[in-house]
Interface confidence: low
């Protein structure tokens, strides 16, 4: 049976020896999981199954990606006649891809007697542990080293059946059972020294392709019993066709129209409907630093810019909590969006003995640094005495005003005697509702804010009984000279609503470092950005005019077409195979000879590193 492409895939389990329910329950669970299954994506765990269990439904399994665990069962035969490969991507007990133990009943004759894995010829990672199976025969006749790929893998086979029949004479002492059909197939230890993997005969020209797993019927990558890495439409390949390939005309990685995705060990044109694409693999869910997006009808995982979006329930009307307090503060960890409102009342900050709520640790207010949006209102009527601004909300961009406080307020700040500035440096929109800022006796800077610029409608402001504007000016509590006339949220160039000249990572500056300074920059509008690290710093001149490695005046290392690169392409995937280049005397990347397979030091065939292909073997990759 050579590799095909359509296979029934099922999930494995990760329960180990912890099992719930009785033997019948176990059997039903196994049946539901593995009926008609061909590839177990995960571990095949058969534990505590009874003596009368008909396990013939396991016969279709050809591959297990994780480990096989068979423990504390009473059935006599484990029928896995088609199991070719155990990949060992997960191993049991830290090192075993096959773990078979304690398969007998001390009070009866029920026991595992035969492990008929007659097709098993490959364990890609991990070792073998078969111990204390009272009636299990022939395990010590198997040449496990022929099956296990890893030379250093541990193989423990002991204390199994003692009065066992011999192997049939045709098996030459290697068998899974007593019959002539039970012989072990050797595909490694019998091979000629020229074969670096497995073989289909003893001759030097009877080696399997290096991408085969478990053996083969011929020398090609389409002749494999199973694939060491991935199966691409019946051919075993080291990688599925990648999402990006090197375009020799643009000197860039570009989308590959023939891309395929890794689904287990198979390359597929599209992932199953309940999977998403992460880089070049099909995964059940995106990792924690990525979020699911849909692009051209394809569900994929994309890295989040900073924290991944996380919406959290707020406080106030329609919520479980009246105020932020010590009982709920931890629920706001990593929240980027508050669905509803945030209320800070004295009972929250100082605690509420009637409800057995302790005082809030002011340090914990830093959880709000991740919040970018509040859909309802922000109501601050109590604030820790030693905190002089609301900088924990320095990343808050939008107050939605979908729900409003009291007489229609979306931002309410009152009676916070120690607050000297608002510090809401990222706030750019108050979508609806009124702004109410009163009776904050030391509060300055708020008169400078162009509130109209923040509001979608005419700003309805009630700002009074804070520190008088004239007094603030006398005390020098005015906007930094680098701020524009739009005003500021507090002192210094990081609190401006917008900048008079340029801005660098949210801080207003006189100018970008265009021609001087250790780190050189370019400007996009009025924002300064660092040049690409592959740009060489030009003394007294412009180092780059954009963010890309193709905008450098000079390269720090090498140039590949228009792009500055840290090294010339070495084996990067092109349209017709890997591309290798070398740097010439002017540090330009030049193509190696078309037959070089490991890079080169110059353009000629004799400049190739390692072995070069004979001329007829490789389609030329002309750059």
């Amino acid at each position: 049976s050579e590799v095909g492409n359509s296979q029934a895939v099922c999930p494995g389990t990760l329960n180990g020896l912890s099992v719930t329910g009785d033997a019948e329950n176990q059997y039903q669970t196994l049946y539901k999981l593995y009926e008609r299954c061909e590839v177990v994506m995960g571990n095949l765990e058969i534990v505590l199954t009874g003596h009368n269990a008909d396990l013939s439904f396991l016969q279709w399994i050809r591959e297990v990606t994780g480990y096989v665990l068979v423990a504390m069962n009473e059935f006599s035969t484990l029928p896995l006649p088609n199991l070719r490969v155990v990949r060992g991507t997960q191993v049991y007990d830290g090192k075993f891809a096959i773990f078979v133990m304690l398969n007998y009943n001390t009070n009866s004759s029920h026991a595992l007697r035969q492990l008929r894995l007659t097709q098993l010829t490959e364990i890609l990672s991990g070792g073998v542990y078969i111990e204390k199976n009272d009636k299990l025969c022939h395990m010590d006749t198997i040449d496990w080293r022929d099956i296990v790929r890893d030379r250093d893998a541990e193989i423990v086979v002991k204390d199994n059946g003692r009065s066992c029949p011999p192997c049939h004479e045709v098996c030459k002492g290697r068998c899974w059972g007593p019959g002539s059909e039970d012989c072990q197939t050797l595909t490694k230890t019998i091979c000629a020294p020229q074969c670096n993997g497995r073989c289909f005969g003893r001759a030097p020209n009877e080696c399997c392709h290096e991408e085969c797993a478990g053996g083969c019927t011929g020398p090609l990558q389409t002749h494999c019993f199973a694939c060491r890495h991935f199966n691409d439409s019946g051919a075993c390949v080291p990688l599925c066709p990648q999402p990006l390939i090197y375009n020799k005309l643009t000197f860039q990685l570009e989308p590959n129209p023939d891309t395929k995705y890794q689904y287990g060990s198979v390359c597929v044109r599209s992932c199953p409907h309940n999977f998403v694409v992460d880089q070049s693999s099909c995964v059940r869910a995106c990792p924690s630093n990525k979020m699911e997006v849909e692009k051209n009808g394809l569900k994929m995982c994309e890295p989040c810019a900073g924290l991944c979006p996380k919406a959290c329930e707020g406080t106030g009307a329609g919520s479980h909590y009246q105020t932020v307090d010590s009982s709920n503060i931890d629920s706001f960890v990593n929240c980027t969006k508050i669905l509803g409102n945030l209320d800070f009342l004295i009972t929250g900050l100082e605690g509420d003995p009637w409800r057995n709520i302790s005082a809030l640790d002011p340090e914990k207010l830093n959880v709000f640094r991740t919040v970018r949006e509040i859909t309802g209102y922000l109501n601050i009527q109590s604030w820790p005495k030693h905190m002089h601004n609301f900088s924990v909300f320095s990343n808050l961009e939008t107050i939605g005003g979908r729900s409003l406080y009291n007489r229609g307020f979306s931002l309410l700040i009152m009676k916070n005697d120690n607050v000297t500035s608002l510090g809401l440096r990222s706030l750019r929109e108050v979508s609806a509702g009124r702004v109410y800022i009163t009776e904050n006796r030391r509060l300055c800077y708020l008169h400078t804010v162009q509130w109209a610029a923040l509001s979608r409608r005419r700003a309805d402001l009630d700002i009074r009984n804070n520190k008088p504007r004239g007094k603030c000016q006398q005390e020098g509590k005015v906007c930094d000279p680098l701020c524009s006339a739009d005003g500021c949220w507090g002192p210094g160039p990081a609190q401006c609503l917008s900048c008079r000249h340029y801005s660098r990572r949210g801080v207003c500056v006189e100018s970008c470092s265009f021609t001087q300074g250790e780190t050189r920059e370019f400007a996009e509008g009025t924002e300064c950005f660092e040049c690409h690290p592959e740009c060489e710093r030009v003394e007294g001149g412009i180092t780059c005019n954009g963010s890309g490695a193709d905008t450098c005046t000079r390269c720090a290392h090498y140039r590949d077409g228009p792009h500055c690169v840290e090294r010339c392409p070495e084996g990067i995937l092109g349209e017709r195979g890997p591309i290798y280049k070398y740097p010439d005397s002017s540090r330009e990347c030049r193509p190696c000879h078309e037959n070089c397979t490991r890079g080169c030091t110059g353009p000629l065939l004799q400049d190739c590193l390692g072995d070069a292909l004979p001329s007829a073997r490789r389609a030329p990759t002309v750059i």
Partner: nanobody, 115 residues
């Protein structure tokens, strides 16, 4: 004179973690892009990670999601937090400024990942 002194290397099992540090002197550390590079036995120098003066991070594909670069400009120190280490991460690790990596400016620290 530019000096870069790495520390924190050692022997660790696959899946383990190490934190490398590099103390810099002799130049305005806070103004430079800083790099971690590595050289495995018998191989060329390989770029691992970079960080800009303002903290913009970059990683080579093989370490993305496992390694984290950071810096403390006040202490003139560069760090590399290495998690989920693999045997292929075994190498001499050097910190470097944005210059040619062919000849590292420092002694390096050895990281060996082995069971």
């Amino acid at each position: 004179e530019v000096q870069l002194v790495e520390s924190g290397g050692g022997l660790v099992q696959p899946g383990g973690s190490l934190r490398l540090s590099c103390v810099a002197s002799g130049f305005t550390f806070s103004s430079y892009w800083m790099y971690w590079v590595r050289q495995a036995p018998g191989k060329g120098v390989e770029w691992v990670s970079a960080i800009s003066p303002g903290g913009v991070e970059r990683y080579t594909d093989s370490v993305k999601g496992r390694f984290t670069i950071s810096r403390d400009n006040a202490k003139n120190t560069l760090y590399l937090q290495m998690n989920s280490l693999k045997s292929e991460d075994t190498a001499m690790y050097y910190c470097a400024r944005l210059t040619s990596f062919a000849t590292p400016e420092s002694q390096g620290t050895q990281v060996t990942v082995s069971s």
